[in-house]
């Protein structure tokens, strides 16, 4: 069962799945000036059996100008250089995501893919949040969200995370004045927020996201 919507938006935070449950779909989208190859799939799908999960299909982009040339799916060195790593303190040991039964790992990038990935998650998927560079986390509880099915409808649990600018410090996290409520923030105010993916996973995260490095964002 696919989740009706995307995980909640938290101001100045990004979210990331550490592994993708079977049934997850990833849009095959290309950056401007490129398009999917003719008869190329619109989606990659995480599928598998009891022992192994993998993405069916490969996303492929070709130049909009050149009608019949197929671009390779391996990223070029200069494309990889475009990505910037943001580290948080105390990195943990990486985990092999393939060891999670019924889950797929992050698909490798494909050449000329769009600047952000659009995933369609399934019920039971968990995503983890962290503050973007320049903001720090104030925790009221777990910085994670799970897609749950209740009364025949899907919903995401609300992550208990507030991201505050590093300049705004107070002695106790409890005294910190939140910048905005996690809910009800207008779409127009979230331009700094890059949700779902564009990340290469470097570590497993602690459930509360206290200690991890995990983002490698497109700029």
């Amino acid at each position: 069962e696919l989740c009706d919507d995307d995980p909640p938006e938290i101001p100045h935070a990004t979210f990331k799945a550490m592994a993708y449950k079977e049934g997850t779909m990833l849009n095959c989208e290309c950056k401007r000036g490129f398009r999917r190859i003719k008869s190329g799939s619109l989606y990659m799908l995480c599928t598998g059996n009891s022992s192994h999960s993998s993405w069916d299909n490969q996303c492929q982009c070709t130049s909009s100008a050149t009608r019949n040339t197929t671009k390779q799916v391996t990223p070029q060195p200069e494309e990889q250089k475009e990505r910037k790593t943001t580290e948080m303190q105390s990195p943990m040991q990486p985990v092999d995501q393939a060891s999670l039964p019924g889950h797929c790992r992050e698909p490798p990038p494909w050449e000329n893919e769009a600047t952000e990935r659009i995933y369609h998650f399934v019920v039971g998927q968990m995503v983890y949040y962290q503050c973007v560079q320049g903001y720090r986390a104030l925790h009221r509880g777990p910085a994670e969200s799970v897609c749950k099915m209740t009364h025949g409808k899907t919903r995401w649990t609300q992550p208990q995370l507030i991201c505050t600018g590093e300049m705004e410090t107070s002695q106790f996290p409890g005294e910190e004045k939140p910048q905005a409520s996690p809910e009800g923030r207008p779409e127009s105010e979230t331009s700094c927020l890059v949700t779902t993916t564009d990340f290469q996973i470097q570590t497993e995260m602690a459930a509360t996201m206290e200690t991890s490095i995990f983002t490698t964002e497109y700029q």
Epitope: D6, N27, E29, S41, L42, Y43, A114, T115, I118, E187
Partner: antibody
Amino acid sequence: QVQLVQSGAEVKKPGSSVKVSCKASGGTFSRYIINWVRQAPGQGLEWMGRIIPILGVENYAQKFQGRVTITADKSTSTAYMELSSLRSEDTAVYYCARKDWFDYWGQGTLVTVSS
Amino acid sequence: EIVLTQSPGTLSLSPGERATLSCRASQSVSSYLAWYQQKPGQAPRLLIYGASSRATGIPDRFSGSGSGTDFTLTISRLEPEDFAVYYCQQYGSSPLTFGGGTKVEIK
């Protein structure tokens, strides 16, 4: 709850253009996939194209390429479909719909092309 | 483009009967197939996506099956409100395409 609300009916002259709007509420508009589908009187459904606002990526059906433009305004959570060089056979109900499996639909906008 | 052929064009049945609608794709669409119900003057309503997953709020008398090129929508026991036109649609590759529709009418 997601809702897609479309602009009202239009009567246009052949050769002119029409711009239909689709305002979304609920969910994260910028990450929506907004599709446009039309239905001529008594006919079936026909896909015209789509946009993903956060990516600024549009795709169009070959039949409408060059004649249709799909745009999105993230600040107002509104998608637009503009069809130019109208002819009588473009008389149809135009729908916007979310995702590629069209889980939510607008109520439809009747565009009548008549001289 | 992928052509979807629906059959039969019209299905005449009585309330309480079972309806079986078919949709055949000109090439494989994997499980990227959806079914819609449309009543006169209304927008279509999503019934099934992913070939077999029921959309939110859809009664369990509606079920979908199949993968690849052959798909079926089954309405186990027709209710009076089920008489409508049904469309299949593929979203495996661009352009997205629809079948021509099957009208389920009261016999």
